[in-house]
Every structure is written in structure tokens, then in C-alpha cells.
Interface confidence: low
């Protein structure tokens, strides 16, 4: 499998799709799970509703959630209020009894909000801080920076 | 389908102003940041500014700082990108791009550009 | 400002050969803030590669990206007569995003 990778911005919502055959996989459950070191196990974040038929419903672990369109074959991730904490290697999985076939490995990274400034001028960017203000978003890439909120550093 | 379509082409002065626009369409408008980039006749391209059309917030490259203005009408799902106090150096084709989820300070959707002669 | 360049300038081939251009940036950008983009005359840019390496949808799998830091390379394997165009690679890492002034490949 190669790995795609999904960059989204800090303190917002990022969606990964993951595409599969959805005749192949009819009547199995999917899965998130994140990868514990290159080698090591994958670790279930989030997995869909226990009756398959139900997929469609959205659940929730913590800022997590995933559905799935099992007549598309589209597996939805959505990972809210993303942080730095988030970047990482994760899998999309299709469950059948105690195995997990993999439909696609994808790599997050974090990145910066680039309207997350006072100064209309700068820009804010990976490698200038550690630090990240939480915010709370419902939707990928559609919000700035909140009223009140402490603002990134400025590009140097 | 998802596509970007901007205005018709345009003359201006030196020291006039020029708003372009980019309408919106096959997608959620509010949640996908617009970015406007140009290209000089036979040059490369110049990235300009951002907009996330969800707020109007907006962020400039400091070159164009105090010269361009991004604006949005969520109504119409178009963008707006005015320059103003036009130079002859200014003539480009101007493009509205979107960026896409997977990698938001990237291009994947572009109008099909908008040429801005300015020319006295 | 990262400045950007590109070499060469112009690459002549063949259908069917194998392209390489570089990109070097003037400063790191780390690994994942690099993207390719393909302009054909009168058109508008399309994009190819973003993250070094990871495929905008839709791109076919000659055209591949690697490198880090301050050196990127686009390969496309095998030049099919539609990929005779210019090549773009933009930064975006540090404000402002920038590009490189592009390579032209062109039929030898």
C-alpha cells in the first residue's frame, strides 16, 4: 500500500476519504486505527456502528468520528480540532471476524493556519513554534481565528 | 462539476483599480480557502493572497499589503480581488485557485484567469 | 522570501524518454511543502504533486515527486505527447508561498 497523505490546518477539522471496492467489502465494518511505530501495531481509534447496515451513522471517539457510504465505497474520517498531537501514520480498515485488510495508509500532518494572525501582512508556518491555541470547528478549512484568541507568532 | 469561472478581461489606466471575480460552483463554498495568484506575459507565477471564504478573513503577500483587497459574498459563492493604484508592471493574466482539503496552501481547482491590461 | 529555482531551464526529449527536473529551494522546506505544477500555453496550471510526493487526484503514475530539505526532483517516466509543457514547483512553507520560474520540456 502506499501512503497518502492529508495535511490539515491546525485547530480546524481535516477529512480523509478512503476509497474501497464496495462489492468486495459488502457486509464488513470498517475502522481507524493509528500506527504505533513503523513496525508496531495499529491502534483502533474509531470504528463504524456494530450493525453494518447502520454505517451511515456517524460515531464519535473523542474528536474523531468516521462513517461510511457502503454503497459508494467511501470510508469518511473526520478528525476535529486537529493539533499537532494528531500527525501521524494512520490506517483505514475493513473488519472481517478478527482479521483487518488495510484500504489505505495515510499519513497526517499538521500545518499552520495561515490566517491565523493580526497583522494581515504575516503568515505563521511549521518550524516557527511549538504552541497551538485550541479552537473549535465543526467544518474542514472554514474558520479563522476566534475573536479573543492569542494569535501565532509572525513569520521572522 | 467543481469549477472556478472569473470575469471577462479588462483595460485600466496607470493608477486606476481593477476588481476581478471568481464565482464558485460544485462545492462548498465556505469550505475551501481561495487563494489569487498572477502571471506576467511569459513569466512564472506570483502567489498574491488568501481568503477563507467561511469568515473574509483574509492574508496578503506583503507585496501587494496596502494595494490588494479580498472580499467574499457567500450569497453568490463568488470572491472578489480588487488591486489597486495600477503600474504598467501589473499587466497579468489573474487566477482564483482553491485549495484542496488534503493540502490547504496548494492549487487544484483554478478559474480560467482573468488578463489585466493596464496601459495608458 | 524562499527564492526557488529550477533547472534546466528547457529540457528537449522524446516521447517515451524519461524526464527529470529540479528544484532548489533557498532555504529548507522541510519535506512536505512542496508542490508540482504542469501549464500547458493558455491554460491554467494544474496541479501535479503536493507534499514532495504524494499525487493530486487524477494525476497518472509517471509523474512522481521526492527529495527534502532543499532539493526536489519531478520524474516523469515515460513523456507521453500530452506532457510537453511547462513545469512549476511552489513552496509553502514560509510566507509568501513561491514558485520556482518554471521548466519547459519540450519535443526534441
Known amino acids: 500500500h502506499n501512503t497518502t497523505v492529508f495535511q490539515g490546518v491546525a485547530g480546524q477539522s481535516l477529512q480523509v476519504s478512503c476509497p474501497y471496492d464496495s462489492m468486495k467489502h459488502w457486509g464488513r465494518r470498517k475502522a481507524w486505527c493509528r500506527q504505533l511505530g513503523e513496525k508496531g501495531p495499529c491502534q483502533r481509534v474509531v470504528s463504524t456502528h456494530n450493525l453494518w447496515l447502520l454505517s451511515f451513522l456517524r460515531r464519535w471517539n473523542g474528536s474523531t468520528a468516521i462513517t461510511d457510504d457502503t454503497l459508494g465505497g467511501t470510508l469518511t474520517i473526520t478528525l476535529r480540532n486537529l493539533q499537532p498531537h494528531d500527525a501521524g501514520l494512520y490506517q483505514c480498515q475493513s473488519l472481517h471476524g478478527s482479521e483487518a485488510d488495510t484500504l489505505r495508509k495515510v499519513l497526517v500532518e499538521v500545518l499552520a493556519d495561515p490566517l491565523d494572525h493580526r497583522d494581515a501582512g504575516d503568515l505563521w508556518f511549521p518550524g516557527e513554534s511549538e504552541s497551538f491555541e485550541d479552537a473549535h470547528v465543526e467544518h474542514s478549512i472554514s474558520r479563522s481565528l476566534l475573536e479573543g484568541e492569542i494569535p501565532f507568532p509572525p513569520t521572522s | 462539476q467543481v469549477q472556478l469561472v472569473q470575469s471577462g478581461a479588462e483595460v485600466k489606466k496607470p493608477g486606476a483599480s481593477v476588481k476581478v471575480s471568481c464565482k464558485a460552483s460544485g462545492y462548498t463554498f465556505t469550505s475551501y480557502y481561495i487563494h489569487w495568484v498572477r502571471q506576467a506575459p511569459g513569466q512564472g507565477l506570483e502567489w498574491m493572497g488568501i481568503?477563507?471564504?467561511?469568515?473574509?478573513?483574509?492574508s496578503y503577500a506583503q507585496k501587494f499589503q496596502g494595494r490588494v483587497t479580498m472580499t467574499r459574498d457567500t450569497s453568490t459563492s463568488t470572491v472578489y480581488m480588487e488591486l489597486s493604484s495600477l503600474r504598467s508592471e501589473d499587466t497579468a493574466v489573474y487566477y482564483c485557485a482553491r485549495a484542496p482539503q488534503e493540502s490547504p496552501y496548494v492549487f487544484d481547482i483554478w478559474g480560467q484567469g482573468t488578463m489585466v491590461t493596464v496601459s495608458s | 522570501e524562499i527564492v526557488m529555482t529550477q533547472s534546466p531551464g528547457t529540457l528537449s526529449l522524446s516521447p517515451g524518454e524519461r524526464a527529470t527536473l529540479s528544484c532548489r529551494a533557498s532555504q529548507s522546506v522541510s519535506s512536505s511543502y512542496l508542490a508540482w505544477y504542469q501549464q500547458k500555453p493558455g491554460q491554467a496550471p494544474r496541479l501535479l504533486i503536493y507534499g514532495a510526493s504524494s499525487r493530486a487526484t487524477g494525476i497518472p503514475d509517471r509523474f512522481s515527486g521526492s527529495g527534502s530539505g532543499t532539493d526536489f526532483t519531478l520524474t516523469i517516466s515515460r513523456l507521453e505527447p500530452e506532457d510537453f509543457a511547462v513545469y512549476y514547483c511552489?513552496?509553502?512553507?514560509?510566507?509568501?508561498?513561491?514558485f520556482g520560474g518554471g521548466t519547459k520540456v519540450e519535443i526534441k
Open positions: 511552489q513552496q509553502y512553507f514560509s510566507s509568501p508561498f513561491t
Open positions: 481568503i477563507n471564504p467561511s469568515g473574509g478573513s483574509t
